[in-house]
Interface confidence: low
């Protein structure tokens, strides 16, 4: 004969543990059924009374196959920094991530606790670690024979052009400006140049690193911006 | 001459509402970050929220509920509408920006350029 | 929320001490700490921005330093016109404020 199935509630066979979705009642001492999620428990149940289930409220959850007495409750809205990708439901929590050109600071088990904005590299500075969803840009002062002209979390230092004949030599964060002979746009930074009987290189100026381009002693938030000049308060 | 004005200050009921402007000259709002700050007789410094040049508005979370901050380029002006208002919110308001233009949301490197204030009294 | 403490309230000092303030966060700020002076009935006066660069005009008397976590305002020979009222400011942290401002500390005469 097969076994006969238990229904819940029922008390287990000693040193034998409840099935799948059932828990085991230290009250009662039976095992009983959990709740599906989405829902909760609103009665437990006793040696002859399964447990009661009930829906969870407007605003709260539960993802798991549970017996608690009360359903949790979703995360706050996001804030303006952040994008909901996942909303409150009866069956999951809200998901908070951040918003293009910001990352997560500081992550909690699902989504982002607190967004930051990308650090953008100012003119003479180019873009060394793209930023990503968890880490910050990481600027480095454009080489010799590189520049970057804009203020961006996103622009490498490009090399200058080269000149047959320069008008003004370029800089860290300035092109050359040939004159009106038709420039040959430069190779990578690093490769090798052939040489040009009439080619002049253009003269670089290296920036002095910002503050901001040294490594930070937060752990937390490890850079944010690059600070103004010193003493340019724009007023 | 780079200034902010403060306007729209005065006497106001307990539960009232009052609109507040910040007028800017001599550069351009919606290329700054401006922060709203204000100041009870006697009491320290309370940042209130500020709007980024993107727009985008910031508040601290005892203002989130009843204090909302806009802006009109084409006034070239800074808005704080308040409601609900309680006599603990009596103080001297203040509109102040960032000393250089920046996306950033507020106050990354201080607040270089602010108004003179506009007093704010709330009481039956 | 964030929290910024300023220590101590209240400091009694005579010209040409000197004098040290701190500005204590709940979270790392990297950099971003500001410093003010305020005199009754005036508006705040920026003097360091980005935890020690020093705003323009403000004399070289004034200096700031830290990171993270723990700053410091220091007045290196306090002046007659030092007396006043000394902030500090977070401006980093966008989401869950509660006042981006530290309590402030008072410079008195002794």
């Known amino acids: 004969l097969p076994a006969q199935v238990a229904f819940t509630p029922y008390a287990p066979e000693p040193g034998s543990t409840c099935r799948l979705r059932e828990y085991y009642d230290q009250t009662a001492q039976m095992c009983c059924s959990k709740c599906s999620p989405g829902q909760h428990a609103k009665v437990f149940c006793t040696k002859t009374s399964d447990t009661v289930c009930d829906s969870c409220e407007d605003s709260t959850y539960t993802q798991l196959w549970n017996w608690v007495p009360e359903c949790l409750s979703c995360g706050s809205r996001c804030s303006s920094d952040q994008v909901e990708t996942q909303a409150c439901t009866r069956e999951q929590n809200r998901i908070c991530t951040c918003r293009p050109g910001w990352y997560c600071a500081l992550s909690k088990q699902e989504g982002c606790r607190l967004c930051a904005p990308l650090r953008k590299c100012r003119p003479g500075f180019g873009v060394a670690r793209p930023g990503t969803e968890t880490s910050d840009v990481v600027c480095k002062p454009c080489a010799p024979g590189t520049f970057s002209n804009t203020t961006s979390s996103t622009d490498i230092c490009r090399p200058h052009q080269i000149c047959n004949v320069v008008a003004i030599p370029g800089n860290a964060s300035m092109d050359a400006v040939c004159t009106s002979t038709s420039p040959t746009r430069s190779m990578a930074p690093g490769a090798v140049h052939l040489p040009q009987p009439v080619s002049t290189r253009s003269q670089h100026t290296q920036p002095t690193p910002e503050p901001s381009t040294a490594p930070s002693t937060s752990f937390l938030l490890p850079m944010g911006p690059s600070p103004p000049a010193e003493g340019s308060t724009g007023d | 001459e780079v200034q902010l004005v403060e306007s729209g200050g005065g006497l106001i009921q307990p539960g009232g509402s009052l609109r507040l402007s910040c007028a800017a000259s001599?550069?351009?709002?919606?290329?700054?970050?401006v922060s709203w700050v204000r100041q009870a007789p006697g009491k320290g410094l309370e940042w209130i929220g500020a709007?980024?040049?993107?727009?985008?508005?910031y508040y601290s979370n005892w203002a989130k509920s009843r204090f909302t901050i806009s802006r009109d380029n084409s006034k070239n002006t800074l808005y704080l509408q308040m409601n609900s208002l309680r006599a603990e919110d009596t103080a001297v308001y203040y509109c102040?920006?960032?000393?250089?233009?920046?996306?950033?949301?507020?106050?990354?490197?201080?607040?270089?350029?602010w108004g003179r204030g506009t007093l704010v009294t709330v009481s039956s | 929320d964030i929290q910024l403490t300023q220590s101590p309230s209240f400091l009694s000092a005579s010209v040409g001490d000197r004098v040290t303030i701190t500005c204590q966060v709940s979270?790392?700020?990297?950099?971003?700490l500001s410093w003010y002076q305020q005199k009754p009935g005036k508006a705040p006066k920026l003097l360091i921005y980005?935890?020690?660069t020093l705003a323009s005009g403000v004399p070289s008397r004034f200096s700031g330093s830290g990171s993270g976590t723990e700053f410091t305002l220091t007045i290196s020979s306090l002046q007659p016109e030092d007396f006043a009222t000394y902030y500090c400011?977070?401006?980093?942290?966008?989401?869950?404020?509660?006042?981006?401002f530290g309590g402030g500390t008072k410079v008195e005469i002794k």
């Open positions: 400011q977070q401006g980093y942290i966008t989401s869950n404020v509660g006042n981006a």
């Open positions: 979270q790392s700020i990297s950099s971003y």
């Open positions: 102040a920006r960032d000393p250089n233009s920046s996306d950033y949301p507020y106050g990354a490197y201080g607040m270089g350029l």
């Open positions: 709007i980024g040049s993107g727009g985008t508005s």
């Open positions: 001599g550069f351009s709002l919606s290329s700054s970050a």
């Open positions: 980005y935890a020690s």
